[in-house]
């Protein structure tokens, strides 16, 4: 079958998910496409524990995550509910700032140098993190 029971080479396993950390930058949409071609998605942070894990691996570097509001409300790329889910915004963020002079506001979320989140111009070439879940069926104990 197509079940993934262990992480691909160069990916890091953590809590039944696999993570890949880029070392170069792309715009948010291009990073999103990159992850899709890896049969993954931009990282979706669902807990403080996952936040700490990702933060440990990326260090103090602006890094895209799978959260955006390009179509209005904030949405996670995998459909995880934003309103009821984990959040770790910097104070007074997101602010959809228009003062950057690049046109439009700020529609894509990234980890900042201290790990907390900020919204920024989606075209900025930041690093990114891909995530893919290990097959849930593989967590089931074998039938005896």
């Amino acid at each position: 079958g197509s079940e993934r029971t262990c992480c691909p080479v160069n990916w890091v396993e953590h809590e039944r998910s696999c993570y890949w950390f880029s070392r170069s930058g792309k715009a948010w949409a291009d990073a999103d496409n990159y992850c899709r071609l890896e049969d993954a998605h931009l990282v979706v942070v669902t807990s403080w524990e996952e936040q700490k894990f990702v933060q440990h691996h990326i260090g103090p570097v602006n890094t895209w995550m799978g959260l955006h509001d390009q179509n209005g409300p904030w949405k996670w790329v995998d459909g995880t509910d934003y309103e009821t889910g984990f959040k770790n915004w910097r104070p007074e963020q997101p602010d959809d700032w228009y003062g950057h002079g690049l046109g439009g506001g700020e529609d894509c979320a990234h980890f900042t140098d201290d790990g907390r989140w900020n919204d920024d111009v989606c075209q900025r070439p930041y690093r990114w993190v891909c995530e893919t879940e290990l097959d849930k069926a593989s967590q089931e104990p074998p039938l005896l």
């Epitope: 197509s2 691909p8 170069s24 930058g25 792309k26 715009a27 949409a29 291009d30 496409n33 990159y34 899709r36 071609l37 890896e38 049969d39 070439p125």
Partner: antibody, heavy 117, light 107 residues
């Protein structure tokens, strides 16, 4: 050793259809996204399409969108390109290639598609 | 789409010469650039990825440099097997696009 072998090219009338295949060996096929790149006679390279390892994600060049369909059968280690509504400008050598970090690290020898009117 | 422009379109050189080919992107692609070599009737071969990373098995006389919009492929001492056409490719954004090619010919 990585090996990619295209087949299925040939002469077809304008408006006709053709299905190209690319047989892969020497690596874990399902772990890699695969692409098609074409080269018109005496011209440069043009990226056509890409498909993720599972087949669940696909992207196309605007020039072929709606006419070409990329697919794969991981049980057969084979990549496909279904080409419909062919035009004279689709005449080219079609290469399959393995995606490597958005680059193409291994290529097949190519198969020639000629669209005549 | 990102346009890639190579120059020159062809260059005549002798064995032992240093040859440089440039590639310009229509927008910033940071270091998402590859160089390929293609010989007549053959498939392209990846030489360099990420602007400057030499692929395994590629001779050290090949080198790549640049970032942003301007990139260079250099061949330090041209060998007989290096006469071919060279293409750059941007891997920053879909659709992935190639330069028009630079043919390195024997003088």
């Amino acid at each position: 050793e990585v090996h990619l072998l295209e087949s299925g090219g040939g002469l077809v009338q304008t408006g006709g259809s053709l299905r190209l295949s690319c047989a892969a060996s020497g690596f874990t096929f399902s772990s890699y996204a695969m692409t098609w790149v074409r080269q018109a006679p005496g011209k440069g390279l043009e990226w056509v399409s890409v498909i993720s390892g599972s087949g669940g994600n696909t992207f196309y060049a605007d020039s072929v969108k709606g006419r070409f369909t990329i697919s794969r059968d991981n049980s057969k280690n084979t990549l496909y390109l279904q080409m419909n509504s062919l035009r004279a400008e689709d005449t080219a050598v079609y290469y399959c290639a393995r995606r490597y970090g958005d680059y193409f690290d291994y290529w097949g020898q190519g198969t020639l598609v000629t669209v005549s009117s | 789409d990102i346009q890639m422009t190579q120059s020159p379109s062809s260059v005549s050189a002798s064995v032992g010469d240093r040859v440089t080919i440039t590639c310009r992107a229509s927008q910033d692609i940071t270091d998402w650039l590859a160089w390929y070599q293609q010989k007549p009737g053959k498939a392209p071969k990846l030489l360099i990825s990420a602007a400057s990373s030499l692929q395994s098995g590629v001779p050290s006389r090949f080198s790549g440099s640049g970032s942003g919009t301007d990139f260079t492929l250099a061949i330090s001492s041209l060998q007989p097997e290096d006469f071919a056409t060279y293409y750059c490719q941007q891997a920053n954004s879909l659709p992935w696009t190639f330069g028009q090619g630079t043919k390195v010919e024997i003088k």
